[in-house]
Amino acid sequence: EPPTACREKQYLINSQCCSLCQPGQKLVSDCTEFTETECLPCGESEFLDTWNRETHCHQHKYCDPNLGLRVQQKGTSETDTICTCEEGWHCTSEACESCVLHRSCSPGFGVKQIATGVSDTICEPCPVGFFSNVSSAFEKCHPWTSCETKDLVVQQAGTNKTDVVCGPQDRLR
């Protein structure tokens, strides 16, 4: 009796269990009572990453430099190309179809985590005792200058955006 289900890496067609094509190959013809499934390797710049019965291979992803993209890993007949972003840019999605410039942390904020090709800069507010007076994608919050260690006194208190201003001690005191 004709099968109703087939083994792994097989598919049912015309009451026959036919072998699927291996990754990197596409289906040319189904098996028959007298012949095997016929498969052909994917062409240049094409891939199929699963056991399949596809009659067309998928095109490798194009890493468009106009969108800030570059090739991180070249595709094979069994894998797609992996794109990443040029230096200073990061992907806008997991699929990495386009890039945006890394965010800078404004004055009063420092870099908690430097951006990568796939993640943006993470900023954090400078806590008490720290400051950042620049807009930067790399600079962390810096600690206020310690006037005491320089035998100086605080003349102007620091903020999250400014360092303390130190000055000489009052000699009259």
Epitope: V28, E33, F34, E36
Partner: antibody
Framework: EVQLQESGPGLVKPSQSLSLTCSVT?????????WNWIRQFPGNKLEWMGY???????NYNPSLKNRISITRDTSKNQFFLKLNSVTTEDTATYYC?????WGQGTSVTVSS | DIVLTQSPLSLPVSLGDQASISCRSS???????????LNWFLQKPGQSPQLLIY???NRFSGVLDRFSGTGSGTDFTLTISRVEAEDLGVYFC?????????FGSGTKLEIK
């Protein structure tokens, strides 16, 4: 339903060429399957002669050396057998077949 | 070429009896994918061969379950569980694993 029908001359002179046509209905010969020519000699012995595949490629029985050619006309859904330099040894019933379906056969006698 | 040896050449049976036909190959018919393309055909008097069993044990559509095929490698058997008058004729095995395809010499099933 798939049907195959052979046609061609029933008598061929020695040293001449034997040409047969197989007309297929109910299935396109370009879709799938191997389209075979098989002959049956007096006394029932069957011999596979060769096939033309759905994609137009061929395979022949080496015993027929360079005498055999199988071609097709996809617009008419027909395939053809040509056997050159025939002798009386080529007298047989000739079948075209997809193997799960066969033509009714055509008898060919080689005689002067 | 693969040689298929069928036995017996003639098989006299009584209606209702079981009949078994053997087909032995000169080399294994299992291909690299683990498939074995050994087929059985019945040729009734005055007719073309008709497919009964493909790939050793699969009944072709419309074939009654009285017909069954078994075997592997080089040794194959066709069994008819209860012979009926319409089963009479010549049975052939055919291998299509290796080119050239080759047939067995045939077994004539007849009434005792």
């Amino acid at each position: 339903e798939v049907q195959l029908q052979e046609s061609g001359p029933g008598l061929v002179k020695p040293s001449q060429s034997l040409s047969l046509t197989c007309s297929v209905t109910g299935y396109s010969i370009t879709t799938n399957y191997y389209w075979n020519w098989i002959r049956q000699f007096p006394g029932n012995k069957l011999e596979w002669m060769g096939y033309i595949k759905y994609d137009g490629s061929n395979n022949y029985n080496p015993s027929l050396k360079n005498r055999i050619s199988i071609t097709r006309d996809t617009s008419k859904n027909q395939f053809f057998l040509k056997l050159n330099s025939v002798t009386t040894e080529d007298t047989a019933t000739y079948y075209c077949a997809r193997l799960d379906y066969w033509g009714q056969g055509t008898s060919v006698t080689v005689s002067s | 070429d693969i040689v298929l040896t069928q036995s017996p050449l003639s098989l006299p049976v009584s209606l209702g009896d079981q009949a078994s036909i053997s087909c032995r190959s000169s080399q294994s018919l299992e291909n690299s994918n683990g498939n074995t393309f050994l087929n059985w055909f019945l040729q009734k008097p005055g007719q073309s061969p008709q497919l009964l069993i493909y790939k050793v044990s699969n009944r072709f559509s419309g074939v009654l379950d009285r017909f069954s095929g078994t075997g592997s490698g080089t040794d194959f058997t066709l069994t008819i569980s209860r012979v009926e008058a319409e089963d009479l004729g010549v049975y052939f095995c055919l291998q299509v694993t290796h080119v050239p395809f080759t047939f067995g010499s045939g077994t004539k099933l007849e009434i005792k």
